[in-house]
C-alpha cells in the first residue's frame, strides 16, 4: 500500500506555494518496490526477479506496455503513438 505524502512547502515565493510530494509505501512479504500505473507501488518480487516488467502494470491506463530487448526495461506507448521508455539499472 502506498500513500502520497506532502513533505514540505516552499514559502519563499509568496505568489505560489510549491509542495514537494513523495510516496510512502509499506510492502507485504513477497513484495518489493516497483511501479504501477506510473506511480511507486509494491509489486510481487517474482515480477522483478523474472524481469517481466509489464506484469506490474507500469503504464498509465490506455497505454501499451512492451518489454525492451534483454528485458532491460519497458516502454509505454500512448494512443497517439508517443513512447516513453524506462530502463532498469
Amino acid at each position: 500500500t502506498c500513500e502520497i505524502v506532502t513533505l514540505d512547502r516552499d514559502s519563499s515565493q509568496p505568489r505560489r506555494t510549491i509542495a514537494r510530494q513523495t510516496a510512502r509505501c509499506a510492502c507485504r512479504k513477497g513484495q518489493i518496490a516497483g511501479t504501477t500505473r506510473a506511480r511507486p507501488a509494491c509489486v510481487d518480487a517474482r515480477i522483478i526477479k523474472t524481469k517481466q516488467w509489464c506484469d506490474m502494470l507500469p503504464c498509465l491506463e490506455g497505454e501499451g506496455c512492451d518489454l525492451l530487448i534483454n528485458r532491460s526495461g519497458w516502454t509505454c506507448t500512448q494512443p497517439g503513438g508517443r513512447i516513453k521508455t524506462t530502463t532498469v539499472s
Partner: antibody, heavy 129, light 103 residues
C-alpha cells in the same frame, strides 16, 4: 565488504534476560531487512526474528514469540535482539543476517529468508543454572 | 516444514544435487563447515555471491529449488541448509540440513 558483528552472548541463568547486538558495516544498513537466526549445539538453523528495513515491521518464530523483541538503530547501523524469560532451550549460537534486497527510499520492505546473502560469525548464548 | 535430504555423497569431479521444497517466495542455500561461519552460496533462487565459485548454481522449478555443485571438490564437504518462507508466507524457515560427503 559487508560485515556483521554480533555481541552480547554469554552464560545466562534460566528466567533471566539478555540483549544481543549486531553491528553492521560496508553497506547501507537502513535499506535492508535483517534477521536473527540461531543454532542449538549439534542442531540445524532456526528462524528467530526479522525486522523491516525501517523498523516498522517485526516478526518472530514460534519458539520465542512473546519473549523476544527485535529492534534496530539505523543511525548506528545496529540490530538488536532482547530476550526475556530465558530457557535452557535458548542455548545456542545466535547469528545476525542480511537480506540482499536494497529497499529504496520511501519504501518499507521485509527481508526474505531466501535472500540472505551475508551472515555474522555468531555469538554464543548458554542458559544454565 | 521444508523437505531436503539428510545426506548426499559424490566423488570428486562429479555433480551433486540437493533439493529443497515446501516454501514460498525465494530460496537460499547456506554452507556450514565444522567450526566455520555460515556462508551463503546461493540466494534469491539462483543468484551467486561474487566470491562463490561458479560450480555452485541454483534453479527453481515450481516450489522446489535445486542446488547443483558441478565438479564437486573436497572442500565442498559441508552441511548445506536451504532457507525460504513457510507456506503461510509469514515467517522464515530452514531445512534440517543436508550433509554433503565427498568420497
Amino acid at each position: 565488504a559487508v560485515t556483521l558483528d554480533e555481541s552480547g552472548g554469554g552464560l545466562q541463568t534460566p528466567g533471566g534476560a539478555l540483549r544481543l547486538s549486531c553491528s553492521a558495516s560496508g553497506f547501507d544498513f537502513s535499506s535492508h531487512g535483517m534477521f536473527w537466526v540461531r543454532q542449538a549445539p549439534g542442531k540445524g538453523l532456526e528462524y528467530v526474528s526479522e525486522i523491516t528495513n525501517d523498523g516498522s515491521g517485526t516478526n518472530y518464530g514460534s519458539a520465542v514469540k512473546g519473549r523476544a523483541t527485535i529492534s534496530r538503530d539505523n543511525g548506528q547501523s545496529t540490530l538488536y535482539l532482547q530476550m526475556n524469560s530465558l530457557r535452557a532451550e535458548d542455548t545456542g549460537t545466535y547469528f545476525c543476517a542480511r537480506s540482499n534486497y536494497a529497499c529504496p527510499g520511501g519504501f518499507s520492505c521485509w527481508g526474505d529468508t531466501g535472500q540472505i546473502d551475508a551472515w555474522g560469525h555468531g555469538t554464543e548464548v548458554i542458559v544454565s543454572s | 516444514a521444508l523437505t531436503q535430504p539428510s545426506s548426499v555423497s559424490a566423488n570428486p569431479g562429479e555433480t551433486a544435487k540437493i533439493t529443497c521444497s515446501g516454501g514460498v517466495y525465494s530460496y537460499g542455500w547456506f554452507q556450514q563447515k565444522p567450526g566455520s561461519a555460515l556462508v551463503t552460496v546461493i540466494y534469491w533462487d539462483d543468484e551467486r555471491p561474487s566470491d562463490i565459485p561458479s560450480r555452485f548454481s541454483g534453479a527453481l522449478s515450481g516450489s522446489t529449488n535445486t542446488l547443483t555443485i558441478t565438479g564437486v571438490q573436497a572442500e565442498d564437504e559441508a552441511d548445506y541448509y536451504c532457507g525460504t518462507e513457510d507456506i503461510s508466507g509469514t515467517a522464515g524457515v530452514f531445512g534440517a540440513g543436508t550433509t554433503l560427503t565427498v568420497l
